[in-house]
């Protein structure tokens, strides 16, 4: 091993303070003691050190903690977090919550980086899944963070954390993960009554199933377009014109401006020309009257 | 026990110099930077400059840039401020206190007076 | 016109609680450290809060500070009659490339 420069006399840090950022880097190195600043990590965060001397720090934390820091040293971490790659963190077991918010409170306002990325797939495992507390918590700094997750890890969020989730928290979740939360939000909601209900069960529709679009038909709910636009274009083709008159209220209107794009187009294309011609808004493109329409699916199933 | 004391302070007319001094014990003064802060008859505290311990940049407050200079002398553990073309509003209380960004001693102050 | 915004008394009884804001700007309180003095009536100031809440040792743990973005504020729990002097915040800023302080209070024990 190479042989370590002795600190200088009188410099031996007693403390950590700001004397501490006038220390060369081998200064830092010879003359701060690591255990020392595992205690006082507290204090690193008001002290403007550079980025070079940050690294000096974290090297001292690293020899002393070669199996991973302990949460009293991650939760006063500050902006040495950001020297973290995602193989220390790998090796850190955060259980508490305020650990966590303490450290995506330094990279707020960023992009979701890596060491975040693997800081909360560490924490999210050690808790088994994905509380209503965490979930608020990384949505609050993350709005897209639920998107950001597999079908596979959503089936762990418990139906109780919906509660925590904002229409905003979804805005770029595709239909699968959607598959994956409207079941739970149907039964996080379903005590409620119906013009509540559809407040918050309106941004997971895009997973909802036709039978349930049939049953909110019935509920005068007055859905935009917006809403419709997003629904799973499987589960819109067998809603009849009235069911879907009656799903959008006065939005119906809307249908015209959408008529050539999905799921609006390919629900046209099933409809009886007879049956959009009574919404008056001159939507074309229906089965014609006379033809027999044979539903394949049907077919396919009895050969 | 950390001990500042300043001297220096007097009586100037405007346009004058003065050199005040503040002989630092008590803490290894090499390793800090220091400061000198102000205190204007019924004011608050303005602060002047700093020099952290090697000397190698120095910090000035826009009233005083050009005018004041600081200067620290760690064999001897002495701060100093040289204050030339003093003006009126530059008279205060100056402090002397160690460190730059939390100043956790002070000294007693020495009265500088401009006036003619 | 000081660059950090105090205000410029407060009072309290024995006893109750008293705060004081300090507002910045994201080159001072948002980017730095805020540091809180003591300044009895006659006397040279004390570091009373220093790293946004640390008190130094022989300060009662009646005084203690916080900071959360560009504002701080100092507390006083259980006022004394001997808390009657002026507080002034303090911050470096990274603009400025200096120390500034708050214009101070004056904190009253009626």
């Known amino acids: 091993e190479v042989e370590k420069t002795a600190c200088p006399s009188g410099k031996k840090a007693r403390e950590i303070d700001e004397s501490l950022i006038f220390y060369k880097k081998w200064e830092l190195e010879a003359c701060v003691d690591a255990a020392l600043l595992a205690t006082q990590m507290d204090r690193v965060n008001a002290i403007p050190f550079t980025y070079e001397q940050l690294d000096v720090l974290k090297h001292k934390l690293d020899e002393l903690y070669p199996q991973g820091y302990p949460e009293s040293v991650i939760q006063h971490l500050g902006y040495l977090f950001l020297k973290m790659s995602p193989e220390d963190i790998r090796k850190w077991n955060v259980t508490s919550l305020e650990t966590l918010k303490a450290l995506l409170e330094v990279n707020k306002g960023h992009e979701m980086s890596p060491q975040v990325a693997t800081l909360i797939d560490r924490f999210v495992k050690g808790r088994g899944q994905l509380d209503k507390d965490t979930l608020d918590t990384l949505t609050a700094f993350y709005p897209g963070y639920l998107c950001s997750l597999s079908p596979e890890e959503l089936s762990s969020v418990p139906p109780s954390s919906i509660w925590a989730v904002r229409p905003q928290d979804l805005d770029t979740c595709d239909p699968r993960q959607l598959d994956v939360l409207y079941p739970k939000a149907r039964l996080a909601f379903q005590n409620m009554n119906g013009s509540e209900y559809f407040v918050k069960i309106q941004s997971f529709l895009g997973g909802a199933p036709t039978e349930d679009l049939k049953a909110l038909s019935q509920q005068n709910v007055s859905m935009d377009l917006a809403t419709f636009m997003k629904l799973r274009t499987d589960a819109v083709l067998p809603l009849t014109v009235a069911e879907v008159q009656k799903l959008l209220g006065p939005h119906v209107e809307g249908l015209k401006a959408e008529e050539r794009h999905r799921p609006v187009r390919d629900w046209i294309l099933r409809q009886r020309q007879d049956d959009l011609d009574t919404l008056g808004l001159g939507l074309q493109g229906g089965i014609p009257n006379g033809y027999l329409v044979l539903d394949l699916s049907m077919q396919e199933a009895l050969s | 026990e950390v001990q500042l004391l300043e001297s220096g302070g007097g009586l100037v007319q405007p346009g004058g110099s003065l050199r005040l001094s503040c002989a630092a014990s008590?803490?290894?003064?090499?390793?800090?930077?220091m400061s000198w802060v102000r205190q204007a008859p019924g004011k608050g505290l303005e602060w002047v400059s700093g020099i952290p311990p090697d000397s190698a940049s120095k910090y000035y407050a826009d009233s005083v840039r050009g005018r004041f200079t600081v200067s620290r002398d760690n064999s001897k553990n002495t701060l100093y401020l040289q204050m030339n073309s003093l003006r009126a509003e530059d008279t205060a209380v100056y402090y002397c206190?160690?460190?730059?960004?939390?100043?956790?001693?002070w000294g007693q102050g020495t009265l500088v007076t401009v006036s003619s | 016109q000081s660059v950090l915004t105090q205000p410029p008394s407060a009072s309290g009884t024995p006893g109750q609680r008293v705060t004081i804001s300090c507002t910045g700007s994201?080159?001072?309180?948002?980017?730095?450290?805020v540091s809180w003095y003591q300044q009895l009536p006659g006397t040279a100031p004390k570091l009373l809060i220093y790293?946004?809440?640390k008190r130094p040792s022989g300060v009662p743990d009646r005084f203690s500070g916080s900071k959360s973005g560009t504002s701080a504020s100092l507390a006083i729990s259980g006022l004394r009659s001997e808390d009657e002097a002026d507080y002034y915040c303090?911050?470096?800023?990274?603009?400025?490339?200096?120390?500034?302080f708050g214009g101070g209070t004056k904190v009253t024990v009626l």
């Open positions: 790293y946004n809440s």
């Open positions: 206190a160690k460190n730059m960004l939390s100043f956790d001693y």
């Open positions: 303090g911050s470096w800023d990274s603009s400025l490339n200096g120390y500034v």
């Open positions: 008590g803490f290894t003064f090499s390793n800090y930077a």
């Open positions: 994201s080159s001072n309180i948002g980017s730095n450290a």
